[in-house]
Amino acid sequence: QSPPGKPEIHKCRSPDKETFTCWWNPGTDGGLPTNYSLTYSKEGEKTTYECPDYKTSGPNSCFFSKQYTSIWKIYIITVNATNQMGSSSSDPLYVDVTYIVEPEPPRNLTLEVKQLKDKKTYLWVKWSPPTITDVKTGWFTMEYEIRLKPEEAEEWEIHFTGHQTQFKVFDLYPGQKYLVQTRCKPDHGYWSRWSQESSVEMPNDFTLKD
């Protein structure tokens, strides 16, 4: 039996700059029941606070709701582990909510097969930013990727589309069913999960319909 090992905060993420969660790895428990607490202060303040919500984001986590989240201040966060034999603390972690955004995936992914005047067909992929993202005001600047593959294939073909919410894919195989997904990343943030798959079958022969 021994004091607990040093915990480590390994991840902090915000879906929208309005709330965020930090998760920690507990470290060894020293063979004894061990309690964990997360404490934090904000830049320029001496007051230390305890985690407002240990439950919402699951085990070994702290959720900061809107009421506790500010993009104007750096959070200095520490996790403390305590058992009957002693205690240990993680290194202090500095968190700027602006830089931990991992948004929800883009939505409304639509696939349309189109034809150029020269009869060349292409797939027109369109999507919308995630619901929570206030892209229009510049609060978020999003970059996007799409990926697609024939249904039976292993490898995805990835296209970076920049800030565009549409993309044209040429040279696809006629008669093949393609799966398509999209994801987004804010400036200075993290890629979202890939969206749900949408699928489309490229026609063998294509008659232009107006």
Epitope: I71, D96, K185, H188
Partner: antibody, heavy 118, light 112 residues
């Protein structure tokens, strides 16, 4: 404790390439961005770029695009920077640095002195 | 790119004196999120730089309170009260509001 270990020096021929390493320890490697900074003798610091070890996403200073390539090896918790087509202008100390969940960095390696000379 | 201009280039001081270093940016360092990402580093001879101050005025963990930062917009100052021998080295200001991040050319704090 957090450590970023870099080799002390590399002597390389003009026109060749060099791959600098930065081995991270004391924390979860994939959690935090790694930055690279150049310092020429007796001069200021230049930010080269950054890489997110979790997915190898990179941001570069335009000035170093085509000169520097940032990569990571997650299995060994090591970040790399390859410098290509070396000239005497590339002779410098190169530092790796680690951010928190912030856009500034507080942990630095000891730096690798690259000397380009025939 | 944002140009960071530091003055003076060299600052001779006596131990116990106050030192003041100025840093001016070629454009405002106020980020679209309202924060100002201006930081100060100290590089001692033969060492890598160490963070002293982040976001204009916040001392990093373990930095003595004789170091203080101030300023806004494009004009910033680092003050060192009662300079000690261990404070000698080159001080750099740095901005991370705009990509690419940029640094000042450095101010060498040395004994008179």
């Amino acid at each position: 404790q957090v450590q970023l270990q870099q080799p002390g020096a590399e002597l390389v021929m003009p026109g060749t390439s060099v791959k600098l390493s930065c081995k991270a320890s004391g924390y979860t490697f994939t959690s935090y961005w790694i930055h690279w900074v150049k310092q020429r003798p007796g001069q200021g610091l230049e930010w080269i770029g950054e890489i997110d070890p979790s997915d190898s996403y990179t941001n570069y200073n335009q000035k170093f695009k085509g000169k520097a390539t940032l990569t990571v090896d997650r299995s060994s918790s090591t970040a790399y920077m390859q410098l290509s087509s070396l000239t005497s202008e590339d002779s410098a100390v190169y530092y790796c640095g680690r951010s928190f969940f912030t856009n500034w960095f507080a942990y630095w390696g000891q730096g690798t002195l690259v000397t380009v000379s025939a | 790119d944002v140009v960071m201009t530091q003055t003076p280039l060299s600052l001779p001081v006596s131990l116990g004196d106050q030192a003041s270093i100025s840093c001016r940016s070629s454009q405002s360092l106020v980020h679209s999120n309202g924060n100002t990402y201006l930081h100060w580093y100290l590089q001692k001879p033969g060492q890598s730089p160490k963070l002293l101050i982040y976001k204009v005025s916040n001392r990093f963990s373990g930095v003595p309170d004789r170091f203080s930062g101030s300023g806004s917009g494009t004009d910033f100052t680092l003050k060192i009260n009662r300079v000690e021998a261990e404070d000698l080295g080159v001080y750099f200001c740095s901005q991370s509001t705009h990509v690419p991040f940029t640094f000042g050319s450095g101010t060498k704090l040395e004994i008179k």
